[in-house]
């Protein structure tokens, strides 16, 4: 009887030990995971994060859709609605260059860098060539008339516009429109002014920054958060807190991301910090990720969202700050009347798009999202979508703008910048991060469940045996 009882007690003890070990392994395992993650997400030589941060292993593409104006004469002569037809995608590979001038500062645990710009056309992912022609707003005419509202100078501009045979609209190739062309009207200005114009001019052989970000050595909760941009903590474009540089650059976030978090990030493209909120759980190539989206609230007017009051910088175009869905970034673009919105004026007020025909906003295609792996905080997939518009106003001194009866926020193009973790990288990520965490979880669960089952089973058997023996 003793052998059997001893065996049962031993089994129960082993079960208890396994269960306790499984239970202990939960916090200890979490601690080990946290320790490993904390070590590996620090932005310093030798870590996984640093290697991927210096040069992204993901191929990033920027697709452009150009708004081809169908009725230029009608608009110019009768102030009709602008009829646009989007043409695209025209795809470029971007962000393929490694960060430059990487400098660690151990004093304040930051790392500074420049992000070089480069774009390579991808014909196989495009509907046409860089030589395709488009009828678009004359960028120089619209910008100059806005920068110089002075009636005297507008007379001078009119002479130059007429002499150069420029008009309200122009025909330009994709390459010219995006990367720059010599404008005939600006070429007549008898002072040393930049005569090159383009939506992204200058781009190639330029760099964004200097960025100075926290490397996470002293506090992992600050990793990748921007300390300064171009040597400053503020942008000097907006009033109050709107001017602050908040969060990361969206390529990664501090680890252990919670669904309840509001993820702040700064985008130099839109000259402001913005935020994303959790939308849904997504499985990305076997990796569980959180999808964070830019909410419509971020584009709301101060009437709907008082937090946005400092993004309203003028009262006329914004109809006393009641318009929404467009952001005037002229202060960030040397006074050029550039307005940023979501594609097809998604989440914008009806008054913004009432002068434009041919737009079809839809959330699925036109919103911005980030798919973030919550443990590491890495952005494994994203789609950044934005539209670039230019304001054009009537001018009684400039012949080609004389017959306009209203202001137009004219869409020029919209872009979709996307990146998705590659299959190889995803496999590696699964094995090194997700896989290990899942394995540890599995071991914990097996130990705990086997232990509990063994303990309960052996204890029941032991009790049963004892009661038999007593009888």
């Amino acid at each position: 009887g003793c052998d059997r009882n001893c065996g049962l007690i031993t089994g129960a003890v082993i079960g208890a030990v396994l269960a306790v070990f499984g239970g202990i392994l939960m916090p200890v395992g979490d601690m080990l995971i946290q320790k490993t993650i904390k070590k590996e997400v620090v932005l310093e030589e030798g870590t996984i994060a640093f290697k991927n941060w210096v040069k992204t292993g993901t191929e990033i593409y920027r697709q452009f859709w150009i708004f081809d104006v169908q009725n230029p004469q009608e608009v110019m002569m009768n102030s009709s609605n602008i009829q646009v037809k989007q043409r695209g995608p025209y795809t470029y590979r971007v962000r393929f260059l490694a960060k430059e001038n990487i400098t660690q500062d151990p004093k304040d645990n930051t790392v500074s860098f420049l992000q070089p710009n480069g774009a390579i056309f991808e014909p196989s992912l495009s509907v046409g060539t860089e030589a395709d022609n488009f009828t678009v707003l004359n960028l120089a005419v619209a910008a100059a008339s806005h920068i110089y509202p002075n009636p005297f100078v507008q007379v001078v501009l009119n002479s130059l516009i007429n002499k150069s045979k420029s008009s309200m609209f122009q025909v330009r190739t994709l390459r010219e429109l995006l990367w720059g062309y010599t404008d005939p009207f600006l070429s007549l200005v008898p002072y040393p002014v930049s005569t090159r114009v383009g939506m992204f001019y200058p781009y190639n052989n330029t760099a964004d920054g200097v960025y100075k970000v926290f490397n996470g050595k002293d506090s992992i909760s600050k990793v990748a958060i921007i300390d300064t941009y171009k040597g400053k903590r503020n942008l000097s474009y907006w009033e109050s807190y709107c001017d602050m540089i908040n969060g990361t650059d969206a390529a990664s976030f501090p680890p252990f991301v919670e669904k309840s978090q509001v993820l702040q990030f700064f985008s130099s493209d839109i000259c402001r910090s913005i935020y994303a909120v959790f939308e849904s759980d997504v499985n990305l190539k076997g990796i569980p990720v959180y999808r964070f989206v830019l909410p419509s609230k971020a584009f709301a007017s101060p009437v709907q969202n008082p937090d946005n009051h400092c993004f309203c910088t003028e009262k006329i175009i914004s109809k006393n700050c009641t318009s929404y869905g467009v952001l005037d970034i002229s202060k960030c673009k040397e006074g050029k009347p550039v307005y940023i919105s979501l594609p097809h004026f998604l989440y914008a007020s009806p008054d913004v798009s009432e002068t434009i025909d041919g737009l079809n906003p839809n959330e699925e295609e036109h919103r911005t999202y980030l798919d973030i792996e919550p443990i590491t905080g890495f952005t494994l997939q994203f789609a950044k979508r934005l539209q670039v518009n230019l304001l054009v106003k009537p001018s009684n001194k400039i012949q080609v703008l004389k017959r306009l009866k209203r202001n137009y926020i004219v869409p020029i193009l919209w872009l979709n910048e996307t990146g998705t973790i590659g299959d190889e990288k995803a496999k590696m990520f699964r094995s090194q991060v997700t896989g290990k965490i899942n394995l540890l979880g599995l071991i914990e669960m097996i130990l705990l469940s086997v232990g509990v089952v063994m303990f309960v089973a052996f204890m029941i058997s032991y009790c049963a045996c004892r009661s038999k023996t007593i009888k």
Partner: antibody, heavy 117, light 107 residues
């Protein structure tokens, strides 16, 4: 070096005419446009006329509208001010000046026009 | 037409003095104001454009300020060669108009 040289001033009877010339060097007048500014003896400056760049529009002060005509000969790089129906109050030193954004960065030395019987 | 009212019409000052001349536009001209210096028998010389922008070659003791309707020309430390008549001018709208001038004389 940018230079503006006025000529053609002199004594003229009321009702008479005079043509002032402004010869430019160091820049092309068509790119900038040329203004005429006058200064009556012991008085302040008064803008008179303007020819916009590239043979653009012409503009005049109300006091000379219909009597004065501004023109330019781009081949000679010279601007002119044709003054008809002259009055005693047109007596002044007439300057030609270069301007693009409305301020005058270069001035001629001036030519005196005296309207007297 | 936009009227430009300059004050004072004349002032007496000594070498080394700080001199301030003001100019008021009858309507908003933003920053489209220029300042000139004129010496007897000579053509005016541009000192400042866009209300604050010092023209090349002009000594840094000259400075301009203001926006909208009120503008100021300041000479931080008057030099012997600065005794002259000063004019403001709006270059916002045709007809271009000048102030009536401020004569700076030796005290």
């Amino acid at each position: 070096e940018v230079q503006l040289v006025e000529s053609g001033g002199g004594l003229v009877q009321p009702g008479g005419s005079l043509r002032l010339s402004c010869a430019a060097s160091g820049f092309t007048i068509s790119s900038f446009g040329i203004h005429w500014v006058r200064q009556a003896p012991g008085k302040g400056l008064e803008w008179v006329a303007w020819i916009a760049p590239y043979g653009g529009d012409t503009y005049y002060a109300d006091s000379v509208k219909g009597r004065f005509t501004i023109s330019a000969d781009t081949s000679k790089n010279t601007a002119y001010l044709q003054m008809n129906s002259l009055r005693a109050e047109d007596t002044a030193v007439y300057y030609c000046a270069r301007s693009f954004f409305g301020y005058f960065d270069y001035w001629g030395q001036g030519t005196l026009v005296t309207v007297s019987s | 037409d936009i009227q430009m009212t300059q004050s004072p019409s004349s002032l007496s000052a000594s070498v080394g003095d700080r001199v301030t001349i003001t100019c008021r536009a009858s309507q908003d001209v933003s920053n489209w104001v220029a300042w000139y210096q004129q010496k007897p028998g000579k053509a005016p010389k541009l000192l400042i454009s866009y209300a604050t922008s010092l023209y090349s070659g002009v000594p840094s003791r000259f400075s301009g300020s203001g926006s909208g309707t009120d503008f100021t020309l300041t000479i931080s430390s008057l030099q012997p060669e600065d005794f002259a008549t000063y004019y403001c001018q709006q270059h916002s709208n045709a007809p271009l108009t000048f102030g009536q001038g401020t004569k700076v004389e030796i005290k």
